[in-house]
Interface confidence: low
């Protein structure tokens, strides 16, 4: 058998909304993937287990089972949606989601997708892990890739 | 529309208990903070306490932390004080108020006339 | 615990004017997010207290825009222009900033 490829391309969109007296955000993210199916047969995307960390604090999970089934050399783009929570021990960033004195709230967050493909019976893992931006101070829409985070300075243009 | 039904007067014995009811109704009794307030005759307004219906999370004052349980049923949207050990200090209308998480107390219930008595 | 504070126990109008009521809260009201969580209420006699007023100058759903609030983190102002007979009651002030939420003492409009 061929590869199947899993490209994680960032995130989509975030949504967030707060709860004032808890002193808690929660962001509902949007992943985008690339599934790429390399073989000559049809392979099934069964299922998508995601999971979002803060600051080495696991925020949010999700799960999405049977979710589609890819033809041969064929390419599938999937989105999913992990709600988050930052509370408790992390409500300190309440502050600095809130705080309308600078434009940009931005997070970075680690994103951990798996996705597990089956054909034939034969079922394969797939495990992705990626830094990324998140502007947890309003609703954002993101180009595709806009989100990413790199672990260089970048010079000022 | 929206609307908290609480009953009119409670008469009890001092040293006993009493669990005052507020009924919600008219939106989504999960989405809003239900607080209670009291105000004894002639005196202005305390806070007592908050409590989420979504997962009973609470606050007290911590004046009342030891008078006031705060409870909700959410098959019947009903949130629920009881005040125990009841003395004469205690009588006093008390008030069961809404609140989403940015906008406070924007719709109150009538109030409950507790009279604590012998 | 934040102590707010309602000077004047009570205010005289004559119909038609405007009347001032003051507040004032022993630490800011302030929060970084831009919102000062400062609410004003009215309760008229015999009935269950009213939101006029909330984060400081927001004007509630319903009420008359002859209503304002004002202020800075910690002095609060709220202002009745053409007071009417039925803005009778007293008007109480409360921060929702930190737990316990607290309330001033009140202030109780009259008509002269």
């Known amino acids: 058998p061929r590869s199947i490829d899993v490209k994680y391309i960032g995130v989509k969109s975030a949504y967030v909304s707060y709860d004032v007296q808890k002193r808690t955000i929660y962001l509902n993210i949007t992943n985008t993937l690339n599934i790429t199916n390399n073989n000559y047969y049809s392979v099934e995307v069964e299922n998508i287990t995601a999971q979002v960390q803060f600051s080495k604090t696991v925020i949010g999970k999700a799960r999405l089972n049977n979710i589609t089934i890819i033809g041969p050399l064929d390419m599938k783009q999937i989105d999913y949606t992990v709600p988050t929570v930052i509370a408790e021990e992390m409500s300190y960033m309440y502050d600095f989601c809130t705080l309308i004195s600078i434009k940009v709230h931005n997070i970075v967050l680690m994103m951990q997708v798996t996705v597990t493909t089956t054909y034939f019976g034969h079922s394969e893992q797939i495990s992705q892990e990626r830094y990324q931006y998140v502007d947890c101070g309003r609703n954002t829409t993101y180009q595709l890739g806009q989100s990413e985070y790199l672990n260089v300075l970048q010079p000022q243009q | 529309q929206v609307q908290l039904q609480q009953p009119g007067a409670e008469l009890v014995k001092p040293g006993a208990s009493v669990k005052l009811s507020c009924k919600a109704s008219g939106y989504t009794f999960t989405t809003f903070w239900m607080h209670w307030v009291k105000q004894r005759p002639g005196q202005g307004l305390e806070w007592i306490g908050n409590?989420?219906?979504?997962?009973?999370?609470?606050h007290y004052n911590q004046e009342f932390k030891d008078k006031a349980t705060l409870t909700v049923d959410r098959s019947s949207n009903t949130a629920y004080m009881q005040l125990s050990s009841l003395t004469s200090e205690d009588s006093a209308v008390y008030y069961c108020?809404?609140?989403?998480?940015?906008?406070?107390?924007?719709?109150w219930g009538q109030g409950t006339a507790v009279t604590v008595s012998s | 615990d934040i102590v707010m504070t309602q000077a004047a126990p009570s205010v005289p109008v004559t119909p038609g004017e405007s009347v001032s009521i003051s507040c004032r809260s022993s630490?800011?009201?302030?929060?970084?997010?831009?919102?000062?969580?400062l609410y004003w209420f009215l309760q008229r006699p015999g009935q269950s207290p009213q939101l006029l007023i909330y984060?400081?100058?927001n004007l509630a759903s319903g009420v008359p825009d002859r209503f304002s609030g004002s202020g800075s983190g910690t002095v609060f102002t709220l202002r009745i222009s053409r007071v009417e007979t039925e803005d009778v009651g007293i008007y109480y002030c409360?921060?929702?900033?930190?737990?316990?939420?607290?309330f001033g003492s009140g202030t109780k409009l009259e008509i002269k």
């Open positions: 984060r400081m100058s």
């Open positions: 630490q800011s009201l302030l929060h970084v997010n831009g919102h000062t969580y």
């Open positions: 108020a809404r609140s989403s998480n940015w906008d406070n107390f924007d719709y």
């Open positions: 409360m921060q929702h900033l930190q737990y316990p939420f607290t």
């Open positions: 409590i989420d219906p979504s997962d009973s999370e609470t």
